[in-house]
């Protein structure tokens, strides 16, 4: 039977002689040269040759494991004389053993990593990996060990895994942010003679909130005019924070001080400044100086750094209110006055009052804005603000007069204020009632007595407090008429009634009835209106057929009474 072990051969042999691989040997070989060894298969006769007498195998060429890691050859042992096999043909392996001809190569030339500042020692940063093309199954040619060449004492690397960790306590980003670490990967388990490769790891410390905000000064002073409307920014304060991003975000608040109600502080997200703004209207005459306590704090606090102290700071803000020459202020936002429409010229209606709110208390003068009183119906006493009439009024023409009064500082005419003045004209019974319309009515020749032929209505331009109450009667000259009568309905209407049976249009075609209408206000006003009644021919249903008088015999057909 065959006697061999697996054959091994080192790759990339550099000797001048053929490289000895091993010996094929059969236990049938008596050493007398009767056996002949034959080699076939992968690379036989080319890469590998055999001494047919001894069975010694040699490699003729420099081999490279990466071309073919294993060669499978066939061995035969035959009787030299007969050519018959002494052993069955058998296969064997020549395994090319790797020499350490490949250095470890990192998967990246440069790694980039981040780790939070102030991280505990041993915090994972990044894992680097190097690969080695040599055979990992043989020797240590591909056994890579990692070490740190640059970056101590800040970082360390696990020799077998390539995991980089923090190695120093309290690494402060605010002190140093960037680190360049150089890692070496060395094969042969890191032993002498091993091949190596390096990579650079750029490590950035990321920010944590380990710094509180700090005001660069303890006191700030700002000035603002008393006229500043709510929302007006009057000054900016800024606390500095050595952190970045959200860890440097600052919220400002007013925590104390007499101006708490009068001022606000808002945070400018862009600049991280606190903007002091006016909250309510200021008044120099009431308070000239305010003192506030403003606090700057981090909204995002990390509990593990609370021991470093409170993550807030305070400063005092002094606000000086500057006096502004303010216009006069009227005692009311608007004035409502009333006057009877029968008031004489120069009748005083009432008065307005305005005062300079400034400490100087400048005197004021009053005037009427003539754009609002084009007809100059009213006037004002420039000294005391009394309003009086300068023309006669008529409620029925204009019920309300809306005028504007101006108050101007005498010493500074630029400072003026305006106030609306609403003057109501009160009613006086100065208009007589009159017919609501022109009344021309008709009566049939065959009309019966006490027939209603017309209802009368009256109107009055006045507006009595208790409402209109009109009375109707025939004028004295027609009161005794035997033709028509008037009936007052006591509801501001009256009826014209026939007083006899039958009318002759040939005798009298038209009657003119004078009617007196009176109101019951003081002084009583009355007027006389005329109702025209025409006599008409009617059919038996009472429908008028003809009211024309052209067929009348008498030339005089008009009467004002009987």
């Amino acid at each position: 039977s065959w006697m061999w072990n697996q054959f091994f051969l080192l790759e990339e042999y550099t000797g001048s002689d053929y490289q000895y691989v091993g010996k094929l040997h059969s236990d049938q070989d008596r050493g007398d040269g009767s056996l002949k060894y034959i080699l076939s298969g992968d690379g036989a006769g080319d890469l590998f040759i055999i001494n047919e007498n001894t069975g010694d195998i040699q490699a003729t060429k420099r081999l490279d494991r990466e071309e073919k890691p294993v060669y499978i050859l066939r061995a035969q042992a035959v009787n030299r004389r007969t050519g018959r096999p002494v052993e069955p043909e058998s296969e064997f392996i020549i395994k090319i053993h790797d020499i350490n001809d490949n250095e470890p190569i990192f998967t990246k030339d440069v790694y980039t990593a981040t780790v939070p500042e102030m991280a505990d020692v041993g915090t994972f940063v990044v894992q680097v990996t190097a690969t080695d093309a040599d055979d990992p199954t043989y020797g240590n040619s591909a056994k890579v060990v990692y070490s740190i060449l640059q970056g101590q004492p800040y970082f360390s690397v696990e020799s077998e895994t390539g995991i980089i960790k923090t190695a120093l306590l309290n690494m402060d980003r605010e002190n140093r942010e960037q680190y360049q670490v150089v890692i070496q990967a060395k094969d042969m388990g890191g032993q002498m003679g091993g091949l190596s490769g390096t990579t650079t790891v750029n490590i950035t410390l990321t920010d944590v909130n380990d710094n509180p905000p700090r005001f660069p000064q303890s006191t700030y002073q700002f000035k603002t005019p008393e006229s500043s409307p709510p929302g007006t920014p009057i000054g900016r304060i800024k606390a500095s924070d050595a952190d970045v991003g959200e860890n440097a975000e600052i919220e400002y608040s007013i925590t104390d001080g007499e101006g708490h109600e009068m001022f606000d502080v808002i945070t400018d997200q862009e600049t991280q400044e606190g903007i002091i703004t006016v909250k309510k209207l200021l008044d120099f005459e009431k308070k000239k100086v305010y003192t506030l306590k403003v606090e700057a704090s981090n909204p995002h606090v990390e509990p593990r750094f609370l021991y470093l102290g409170p993550f807030k700071d305070s400063a005092t803000v002094r606000i000086v209110v500057d006096d502004v020459d303010e216009p006069p202020v009227f005692s009311k936002l608007a004035y409502i006055l009333q006057i009877r429409e029968d008031a004489r010229i120069n009748t005083t209606i009432g008065s307005v009052a305005a005062q300079d709110p400034d400490a100087a208390r400048n005197p004021v003068k009053y005037s009427v804005d003539r754009h609002t009183d084009m007809d100059r119906i009213f006037n004002i006493d420039s000294g005391n603000g009394s309003i009086f009439t300068s023309k006669l009024l008529d409620r029925e023409t204009l019920l309300w007069h809306n005028i504007t009064v101006i108050a101007t500082e005498i010493n500074n005419p630029k400072q003026s204020s305006r106030v609306p003045l609403y003057i109501k004209v009160l009613d006086v019974n100065d208009n007589a009632p009159e017919f609501a319309e022109f009344y021309e009515t008709f009566v049939c020749e065959k009309a019966k007595a006490d027939q209603l032929i017309q209802t009368l209505r009256a109107v009055d331009k006045d507006d009595p407090y208790s409402g209109h109450q009109f009375s109707f009667s025939l004028a004295p000259e027609a009161a005794s008429s035997s033709n028509f009568t008037i009936q007052d309905n006591k509801d501001n209407t009256a009826g014209i009634l026939t007083r006899k049976n039958g009318y002759n249009r040939h005798e009298m075609s038209t009657y003119l009835l004078p009617v007196v209408i009176s109101d019951n206000d003081y002084p009583v006003q009355s007027s006389t209106g005329t109702v025209t009644v025409r006599v008409c021919a009617c059919d038996h249903h009472g429908n008028m057929q003809s009211c024309h008088a052209e067929a009348l015999i008498h030339p005089t057909g008009l009467s004002t009474g009987a």
């Epitope: 990466e66 071309e67 294993v70 499978i72 066939r74 058998s90 190569i105 093309a133 199954t137």
Partner: antibody, heavy 120, light 108 residues
């Protein structure tokens, strides 16, 4: 001329078995190591298994190890692949190929392939 | 273990030069072979041992291997060269590894 011809493919249910054959002609079959390579539909080539010229040494891809067995009968100039415990992901065209020392141990020639479909 | 990476596709105009790459860590230390596969056909060896052409393969096919990249070059590409191309090498012991394949499209 040198030729390889595969057979034995077909439809089989998951968990089933199939035996592929590769008939060689035009060269001394017993002098060459042989390989099986497969190609899933629309995918690339995947090496499956190797057998040395006399059949003493065999080797398998991790994906088929323990389920597939490569063998040869040099007297019949035939290469075999016994496939057991088949899975859907074994669906592919299976090629046999000769390892040619003269071409730096590359594969030349290849058979035309046989389709194996694993589906329920 | 070596891993071979190929671009999924490469396009070239007729008569132009097509280059198909196969990359892997220190690939220069490994012998690379190239195969051509046309639709519905078996693969055909076009380059062996990095840069050698088997008999019957046109001269326009050539190969190179250095650093981390092996390259198959087809100069004066013809329409009939449109196919999938695969690189291959020996891995550890008796295992074989293929690249993912590159589809070569000849435009026009």
């Amino acid at each position: 001329q040198v030729q390889l011809l595969e057979s034995g493919g077909g439809l089989v249910q998951p968990g089933g078995s199939l035996r592929l054959s590769c008939a060689a002609s035009g060269f001394t079959f017993s002098s060459y190591a042989m390989h099986w390579v497969r190609q899933a539909p629309g995918k690339g080539l995947e090496w499956v298994s190797f057998i040395s010229s006399l059949g003493s040494y065999t080797y398998y891809a991790d994906s088929v190890k323990g389920r597939f067995t490569i063998s040869r009968d040099n007297s019949k100039n035939t290469l075999y692949l016994q496939m057991n415990s088949l899975r859907a992901e074994d669906t592919a065209v299976y090629y046999c190929a000769r390892e040619t020392a003269g071409y730096g141990y590359a594969f030349d020639p290849w058979g035309q392939g046989t389709l194996v479909t694993v589906s329920s | 273990d070596i891993e071979l990476t190929q671009p999924p596709s490469v396009s070239v105009s007729p008569g132009q030069t097509a280059s198909i790459t196969c990359s892997g860590d220190n690939i220069r230390k490994y012998v690379v072979h190239w195969y051509q596969q046309k639709p519905g056909q078996a693969p055909v060896l076009v380059i062996y041992r990095d840069n050698n052409r088997p008999s019957g393969i046109p001269e326009r096919f050539s190969g190179s291997n250095s650093g981390n990249t092996a390259t198959l070059t087809i100069s004066g590409t013809q329409a009939e060269d449109e196919a999938d191309y695969y690189c291959q090498s020996w891995d550890s012991f008796l295992a074989v590894v293929f690249g993912g394949g590159t589809k070569l499209t000849v435009l026009g």
